[in-house]
């Protein structure tokens, strides 16, 4: 039994850390492997992560861990058994993901307007809280050719959308993903995505 | 209450052993790093060894690295110090101090918040 | 190894004055924003040590609000904001961010 690719890992910066390897064959991850992790602290201990199948021959963890500190570094060992597979360490702060902003609402009531609001997904006393930037994807699933990429700089939440730029009768969707600029964080995951019909109509006298 | 008890000190000659006990009460015991520190007639506060809530992880210093063994009894609630090929400057005053809780990701660190009533260890010829 | 430096050694105090007690490390004991690993422990005479501050300013359980500790990476310091008879004993700072802990020379605290 061989890793193939060795674990590559990504953290939330809160709690979570998810570490990803192929394996050289089929491989039951959970049955057959544990990811083993310690913080390279006084009097820690370690910690076991029991991995799931991702695919084939790949396998997923999901590390439990304390808030993220830039200092943190842990150890991994990769074992199958008493065999150890890969010996490898991580610094979580050096590797941010953030976690998918949640809750995307559309208003639509909001007179010409379109305004799209959602979560930030941490809490206040996180240090990304205040240095997520986000993307907006809309899109049409009755005009193909229709997607548009909308770049939120600003730590508030929303994106408005003149109304008159979007076309009337037809639907469209929304997701949106995050980063953190002074973190150096990869693109989070999208959100779930939202669905809205545009039924704004230009005034009779525009036409 | 929390509460920790040594025991074992006494006289011994240069080169002999002793095995100090430290009962824990009044906290769960397997959780926290325990450590401990002596003290020379007359003089300051030294640490001396230290070891996780699980037992896997051990630390020494210089002066007794290869002497001293620190372990414990999570059934018993017990830490000990096997002291081996003992010498006149080991002669002290050992406290055991209830150190941090370990059994997190990080350990949560809440000072030395416990210490024993200390045994007194006398190394002569 | 981090060397722990007090200052100063003997401390004569008025009782209802203050008192401050310096401790400088060789090097940063700060793990991250708030978790400086320095602790202040008093030692009463033919007793055990007793802690008093943990993570340069976090009052232990029972400890009374006259003492106090600040401070962050190399420079801490205790402060007893009105000396009391009962305050008297050695004062120690130790670094516990890695082995091996390292203690203060002690500082001996009297009343004039």
């Known amino acids: 039994m061989k890793v193939l690719q060795e674990p590559a890992c990504v953290s939330d910066y809160m709690s979570i850390s998810t570490c990803e390897w192929k394996m050289g064959g089929p491989t039951n991850c959970s049955a057959e492997l544990r990811l083993l992790y310690q913080l390279v602290f006084q009097s820690s201990e370690t910690h076991t992560c029991v991995p799931e199948n991702n695919g084939g021959v790949g396998c997923v963890c999901h590390l439990l861990m304390d808030d993220v500190v830039s200092m943190d570094n842990y150890t991994l060992d990769l074992w199958a058994g008493q065999q150890l597979l890969w010996k490898g360490s991580f610094k979580p702060s050096e590797h941010v993901k953030p976690r998918a902003p949640g809750n995307l609402t559309v208003h639509t009531n909001v007179s010409d307007t379109v305004l799209l609001t959602w979560s930030n997904p941490y809490p206040p006393d996180n240090y990304l809280y205040n240095d997520l930037t986000y993307a907006v994807n809309i899109w049409s699933e009755n005009d193909p050719a229709y997607s548009r990429i909308h770049n939120v700089t600003y730590l508030k939440p929303t994106l408005r959308i003149p109304a008159s730029t979007l076309k009337s009768g037809i639907s469209y969707r929304a997701r949106v993903r995050a980063w953190a600029q002074h973190y150096n964080t990869t693109w989070s995951e999208w959100s779930p995505s939202t669905k809205w019909y545009n039924s704004y109509r230009e005034p009779f006298e525009q036409r | 209450e929390v509460q920790l008890v040594e025991s074992g000190g006494g006289l011994e000659q240069p080169g002999g052993s002793l095995r100090l006990s430290c009962a824990g009460s009044?906290?769960?015991?397997?959780?926290?790093?325990m450590t401990w520190v002596r003290q020379a007639p007359g003089k300051g506060l030294e640490w001396v060894s230290s070891?996780?809530?699980?037992?896997?992880?051990?630390y020494y210093a210089d002066s007794v690295k290869g002497r001293f063994t620190i372990s414990r009894d999570n059934s018993k609630n017990t830490l000990y110090l096997q002291m081996n090929s003992l010498r006149a400057e080991d002669t002290a005053v050992y406290y055991c101090?209830?150190?941090?809780?370990?059994?997190?990701?990080?350990?949560?660190?809440?000072?030395?918040?416990?210490w024993g009533q200390g045994t007194t260890v006398t190394v002569s010829s | 190894d981090i060397v722990m430096t007090q200052s100063p050694l003997s401390l004569p105090v008025t009782p209802g004055e203050p008192a401050s007690i310096s401790c400088r490390s060789s090097q940063s004991v700060l793990y991250s924003i708030g978790y400086n690993y320095v602790d202040w422990y008093l030692q009463k005479s033919g007793q055990s040590p007793q802690l008093l501050i943990y993570?340069?300013?976090k009052r232990a359980s029972g400890v009374p609000d006259r003492f106090s500790g600040s401070g962050s990476g190399t420079d801490f310091t205790l402060k007893i904001s009105r000396v009391e008879a009962e305050d008297v004993g050695f004062y120690y700072c130790?670094?516990?961010?890695?082995?091996?802990?390292?203690f203060g020379q002690g500082t001996k605290l009297e009343i004039k």
């Open positions: 130790m670094q516990s961010l890695q082995t091996p802990y390292t």
């Open positions: 993570l340069g300013n």
């Open positions: 009044g906290f769960t015991f397997r959780d926290f790093a």
């Open positions: 101090a209830k150190d941090r809780l370990s059994k997190t990701i990080r350990p949560r660190y809440y000072g030395l918040d416990v």
């Open positions: 070891i996780s809530g699980d037992g896997s992880n051990t």
